[in-house]
Interface confidence: medium
């Protein structure tokens, strides 16, 4: 069964750093989606070999990309005490798979000491459920509009 | 329950023009992205164009580009494909949709309801 890896379980930052999340698949996939989960989970970048990434306006212009769908790192730069979260990788397949989830803590640099990630994975209680028995996301509220490509980027 | 209907297809002779109307029903859909696709026999959903609700954003395939325009009418619930200088390569059966997701909006997994489709025949 497909599976994505996802690294690191956790990571506390100062604000104003960056931070990198891996997700990696055995490949087979049409896209990645970064979501930062919540009370209304929210899509952060969608990433497809081929296509421009396009990036929520929250994030417009403190992302980058290495790698490849089947192995993509996801930089997010200029971190704020907002960007606080889990975020998880959702593969789009014909199952949606999702990794097991980045807790990101950004802190104020003079509280690094207070609040630090232990070795452990985020719950899995704060993961979304797979999809059943659909290949499309579940509905959800956007709070922003993305950044989308320029159109001559679309395939 | 979120309704989509087009109209508006029909038979049309190479270099003609028509226009597709998406009439949406069922909620308020200001922050949705709307699109509109089409599909030949033995193949897959192709994107043609989207239009981010609220801001207004357009984006199109490249096949379409400059000929095909993608607007909405917020009084109406209503979006609308008019489409210019049709080909021959552009029968299909064109379906809008509607998402709130919005990232991947060329691809049909961004896309929540669906409405029934309406023909478009260009002859040469």
């Known amino acids: 069964a497909q599976e994505v890896q996802q690294s690191p379980h956790c990571t506390t930052v100062p604000v104003g750093a960056s931070v990198n999340i891996t997700c990696s698949t055995s490949g087979g996939l049409r896209g990645i989606y970064l979501r930062q989960l919540g009370p209304q989970p929210q899509d952060i970048i969608y990433y497809e070999d081929g296509v421009v990434p396009t990036t929520d306006r929250r994030f417009r212009g403190r992302i980058d990309f290495s790698g490849s769908q089947d192995n993509l790192t996801i930089t997010m730069h200029r971190l704020q005490l907002s960007d606080t979260g889990t975020y998880t990788c959702q593969a789009i397949t014909e199952v949606n798979v999702y990794g097991s989830g980045t807790l990101v803590l950004v802190t104020e640099e003079q509280s690094q000491g207070w609040h630090r990630c232990s070795d452990a994975p985020p719950r899995a209680s704060a993961l979304p459920a797979p999809p059943t028995g659909s290949a499309l996301p579940d509905p959800q509220t956007a709070s922003a509009l993305p950044d989308p490509p320029a159109a001559s980027a679309l395939p | 329950q979120v309704q989509l209907q087009e109209s508006g297809g029909g038979l049309v002779q190479a270099g003609g023009s028509l226009r597709l109307s998406c009439a949406a029903s069922?909620?308020?859909?200001?922050?949705?992205?709307m699109g509109w696709f089409r599909q030949t026999p033995g193949k897959e959903r192709e994107f043609v164009a989207a239009?981010?609700?609220?801001?207004?954003?357009?984006y199109y395939a490249d096949s379409v580009k400059g000929r095909f325009t993608i607007s909405r009418d917020n009084t109406k619930n209503t979006m609308y494909l008019q489409m210019n200088s049709l080909k021959p390569e552009d029968t299909a059966v064109y379906y809008c949709?509607?998402?709130?997701?919005?990232?991947?909006?060329?691809?049909?997994?961004?896309?929540?309801?669906w409405g029934q489709g309406t023909q478009v025949t260009v002859s040469s």
């Open positions: 239009i981010y609700w609220n801001a207004g954003s357009t």
């Open positions: 949709a509607a998402g709130q997701r919005g990232l991947a909006y060329a691809r049909t997994y961004d896309y929540d309801y």
């Open positions: 069922g909620r308020t859909f200001s922050d949705y992205l």
